[in-house]
């Protein structure tokens, strides 16, 4: 996977008037490392490793840059014509990447009320607009405003990409200490379901790097893919990741199954615990809508935050 730096910014408007401030977070290689404190109007580290590794100068620079980007986004939102009453959002996701062959990529994506309406390649300055007429209208609105705005020249886009890549390289350098191997903590739980079947769930948490194999084995052999259900590998906010795998088995056959975990060249096998006390119905959480960081703020306002 390429190394990446991603910024997520959002501004809101209520009944046609753009709210002050903005929401923002930053991800380094998919890990949250920055959050913007709206009250203090400052970029702050997210996760212990960001705090430990990246110095005060980082947060000053990030605060300045985000403030400028936030203002740009607010001004753009004021020029979106179709704002009806109620709450609206404009979101920008900006990403730059360094690939293994040292090639680079850069892009930014704009969403209005959670719907993508414009993507730009920061290296070629090419724009892509979805087919829908709403997206076409929004994109035209915004690009017309940018044409009037002297700042939005090709040099500006190039500088934006160069700045992003420079930061990414700097963070990766200072982040050498981060790129250690943290083995996963694995735990297996059962939950009762109907007709003599139980669901066994194996959770791996607090691991780094992200690549992991988690699979159920029966009598020593891996189960087929279609008999297992996997969760996404998600950042847990501490610079590490979490995931899960589940399968349904006949009650009484628990001992034939083991959760097999493979991570960074090491593996472990984790059997199903015995005893009624370990049938945990409370473990049945909905893994599909697990959001991190600032999302709860947006949730309250029923605004979709694109990861």
């Amino acid at each position: 996977e390429p190394h990446s730096l991603r910024y997520n910014l959002m501004v809101l408007s209520q009944d046609g008037s753009v709210q002050s401030g903005f929401l923002a977070e930053g991800h380094l290689d998919g890990q949250p490392f920055l959050r913007y404190d709206r009250q203090k109007r400052r970029a702050k580290p997210q996760g212990q490793w960001a705090e430990d590794v990246l110095g005060a100068k980082t947060w000053d620079t990030e605060t300045e840059d985000l403030t400028e980007n936030g203002q740009d986004l607010r001004r753009t939102l004021t020029h979106i014509k179709d704002q009806k009453g109620g709450l609206h959002s404009l979101q920008e996701i900006r990403v730059c990447e360094i690939h293994e062959d040292s090639s680079t990529r850069g892009s930014r994506h704009f969403y209005y009320d959670g719907e993508l309406f414009l993507s730009q390649n920061l290296e070629t300055q090419e724009s892509t607009v979805p087919q829908s007429s709403r997206a076409q209208t929004l994109a035209m609105n915004v690009t017309n405003f940018w044409k009037e705005d002297a700042m939005k020249t090709k040099t500006h886009y190039r500088a934006m990409q160069a700045d992003c890549l420079q930061k990414l390289q700097r963070y990766l350098k200072s982040g050498v200490a981060i790129r250690r191997t943290v083995p996963p903590m694995v735990n297996v739980t059962c939950s009762e379901v109907s007709e003599g079947n139980i669901t066994v769930t194996c959770r791996a948490s607090s691991f780094y790097p992200r690549n992991i194999t988690l699979t159920w084995r029966q009598d020593g052999v891996s189960l087929s893919h279609n008999t297992q259900q996997w969760g996404d590998v998600l950042p847990d906010g501490n610079g590490t990741y979490q995931t899960w795998v589940a399968t349904r088995i006949r009650q009484g056959e628990e001992q034939r199954f083991t959760c097999y975990m493979e991570h960074s060249g090491n593996h472990g096998t984790h059997p199903v615990p015995s005893g009624k006390a370990l049938v945990l119905q409370s473990q049945r959480t909905d893994h599909h809508h697990h959001h991190h960081g600032l999302n709860d703020i947006f949730e309250a306002q029923k605004i979709e935050w694109h990861e």
Partner: antibody
Framework: QVQLQQSGAELVRPGTSVKVSCKAS????????IEWVKQRPGQGLEWIGG????????NYNEKFKGKAILTADKSSSTAYMQLSSLTSDDSAVYFC??????????WGQGTTLTVSS | DILLTQSPASLSASVGETVTITCRAS??????LAWYQQKQGKSPQLLVY???TLADGVPSRFSGSGSGTQYSLKINSLQPEDFGSYYC?????????FGGGTKLEIK
């Protein structure tokens, strides 16, 4: 039928290394984990570690980290254990075995290692 | 690490007798216990797994029982071929340790 055929007895000098092999047959080699066990003369059994022949991933007993290196060759269905910096404490019979879930179902016949000057 | 304490360390019995070997774990191993028999100069052979399931081809005079931290292997009506060493091994969490072994000799 399932068989694990180990290499023959070894007599080696202290400070050297040795590589013991375990050739599997009668089943799909990459489907099961292979474990290694040590037994000193007249003593009990000690689990050294295991390897997934499909991926090469390993799981070592802390006690044997730095002493044993486990590898596997899929093309020949053979698992290997290399023991380094040998001392008389390493003189033992070494077994490979197949992990059949939560128990060891099949064992190799054992390889006797004698470390002597 | 989970420690397995096997007792007795050695045992003399006659053909036809019934013997019991015990294995105590230092923590709950949730029935993930196997018993092996080993004859002099040979590799161990699986007798019982999951604490009480008899392996294929093992005579029914062998039986395993127990749960939590206490497990035992019982051999009814000892036969001449039953003499040798017996080991328990747990598979709850690595390192998978073995008991110290029980040497069963003919009286």
């Amino acid at each position: 039928q399932v068989q694990l055929q180990q290499s023959g007895a070894e007599l080696v000098r202290p400070g050297t290394s040795v590589k013991v092999s375990c050739k599997a047959s009668g089943y799909a080699f990459t489907d099961y984990l292979i474990e290694w066990v040590k037994q000193r003369p007249g003593q009990g059994l000690e689990w050294i570690g295991g390897i997934n022949p499909g991926s090469g991933s390993t799981n070592y007993n802390e006690k044997f980290k730095g002493k044993a290196i486990l590898t596997a060759d899929k093309s020949s269905s053979t698992a290997y254990m290399q023991l380094s910096s040998l001392t008389s404490d390493d003189s033992a019979v070494y077994f490979c075995a197949r992990l059949d879930g939560n128990y060891v179902g099949y064992w190799g016949q054992g390889t006797t290692l004698t470390v002597s000057s | 690490d989970i420690l397995l304490t096997q007792s007795p360390a050695s045992l003399s019995a006659s053909v036809g007798e019934t013997v019991t070997i015990t294995c105590r774990a230092s923590g709950n191993i949730h029935n993930y216990l196997a018993w092996y028999q080993q004859k002099q100069g040979k590799s161990p052979q699986l007798l019982v797994y999951h604490a009480k399931t008899l392996a294929d081809g093992v005579p029914s005079r062998f039986s395993g029982s127990g749960s939590g931290t206490q497990y035992s292997l019982k051999i009814n009506s000892l036969q001449p071929e039953d003499f040798g060493s017996y080991y328990c091994q747990h598979f709850w969490s690595t390192p998978w340790t073995f008991g110290g072994g029980t040497k069963l000799e003919i009286k």
